[in-house]
């Protein structure tokens, strides 16, 4: 359990991950969770993964914004876009290749401040 | 409901550029959270994917096409569009246009009824 | 590519048959395939998405099952308006690749 808070004092969020891992051929969740916010248009969820310059996904103004998704990602993520309102950052991960392992970043921009965390992410063939 | 609807020429000269647009009515493009696909179908055979394109103008491409493909969008009109360059007779086919079910599930509902581009001189 | 493999590619059938499609997938797709209905001159219809999810709208003699490189579609009583071309889908990985097709005929 990772628990992250925003960098701007008064303006932080507190934002939490799950270290988890998925099986390689599978779909994955990468788990985050955020304080919630009363309007879905001032939330913003940005997943970043270390060393990928695109973004792994973003969600902001209600809807998906994938024009910065780095290709390798592209058609196979997805948020739970009914949930993110009650504060469900989550993130599903289509078709889990080994090279998705690694360390992401959940971040997250709403009304009341910002904050972030990591999450490590492993792969493999688990049963 | 979303419903969508091809236009364009039927009948495109060798080396030429098929030119399609695909209107989307019942439903803005600029929504989000789906892909909008262009497929076509040579006569009497199977289905092939050519490529994709989210509202933002992120595209992605066959690439057994690519180097001749290019998918646009302009969400002022509702539309996205198709241009297929050097077309041989081999190109010749029903042009669909399609929605993703989801940015994740890409299985492929509603389509446009389909136009058929003929490559002939 | 992802090579999508449908058998039979025809099959004769009568009303009120058990009908089975199968599709098989040249590598592991997970539960990432749709299946189609196509009729001539028209485009084709979704039926299941995610290898088991029936489409809104589609009648309940329609199933879809399997999961990683192999499935199938059964009609379980076929009907007068079945008889048309199915084709299974893997949007497991780009690019998006289309089964050969499978034209049910009357017997």
């Known amino acids: 359990l990772i628990i992250g808070f925003g960098i701007s004092g008064r303006h932080s969020i507190t934002v939490t991950t799950v270290a988890s891992a998925g099986n390689i051929g599978e779909d994955g969740i990468l788990s985050c969770t955020f304080e919630p916010d009363i309007k879905l248009s001032d939330i913003v969820i940005q997943w970043l993964k270390e060393g990928v310059l695109g973004l792994v996904h973003e969600f902001k103004e209600g809807k998906d914004e994938l024009s910065e998704q780095d290709e390798m990602f592209r058609g196979r993520t997805a948020v739970f876009a009914d949930q993110v309102i009650v504060g469900n950052a989550s993130l599903r991960l289509k078709n889990v290749q080994l090279t998705d392992a690694g360390t992401y970043k959940c971040y997250i921009i709403t009304s009341k401040g910002k904050g972030n965390a990591n999450l490590e992410y492993k792969t493999g063939a688990f049963s | 409901q979303v419903q969508l609807q091809e236009s364009g020429p039927g009948l495109v000269k060798p080396s030429q550029t098929l030119s399609l647009t695909c209107t989307v009515s019942?439903?803005?493009?600029?929504?989000?959270?789906?892909?909008w696909s262009w497929i076509r179908q040579h006569p009497g055979k199977g289905l092939e994917w050519i490529g994709n394109?989210?509202?933002?103008?992120?595209?992605y491409y066959n690439p057994s096409l690519k180097s001749r493909v290019t998918i646009s969008v302009d969400t002022s009109k509702n539309q996205f569009s198709l241009k297929l360059s050097s077309v041989t007779a081999a190109d010749t086919a029903v042009y669909y246009c399609a929605r993703g079910l989801s940015t994740i599930d890409e299985a492929f509902d509603p389509w446009g009824q389909g136009t058929l581009v003929t490559v002939s001189s | 590519d992802i090579q999508m493999t449908q058998s039979p590619s025809t099959l004769s059938a009568s009303v009120g048959d058990r009908v089975t499609i199968t599709c098989r997938a040249s590598?592991?797709?997970?539960?990432?395939l749709a299946w189609y209905q196509q009729k001539p001159g028209k485009a084709p219809k979704l039926l299941i998405y995610?290898?088991?999810s029936l489409e809104s709208g589609v009648p309940s003699r329609f199933s879809g099952s399997g999961s990683g490189t192999e499935f199938t579609l059964t009609i379980s009583s076929l009907q007068p308006d079945d008889f048309a071309t199915y084709y299974c889908q893997q949007d497991n990985s780009y690019p998006y690749t289309f089964g050969g097709g499978t034209k049910v005929e009357i017997k």
């Open positions: 019942g439903g803005s493009i600029s929504s989000g959270g789906y892909y």
């Open positions: 394109i989210y509202y933002s103008g992120s595209t």
């Open positions: 995610k290898a088991s």
């Open positions: 590598q592991s797709i997970s539960s990432w």
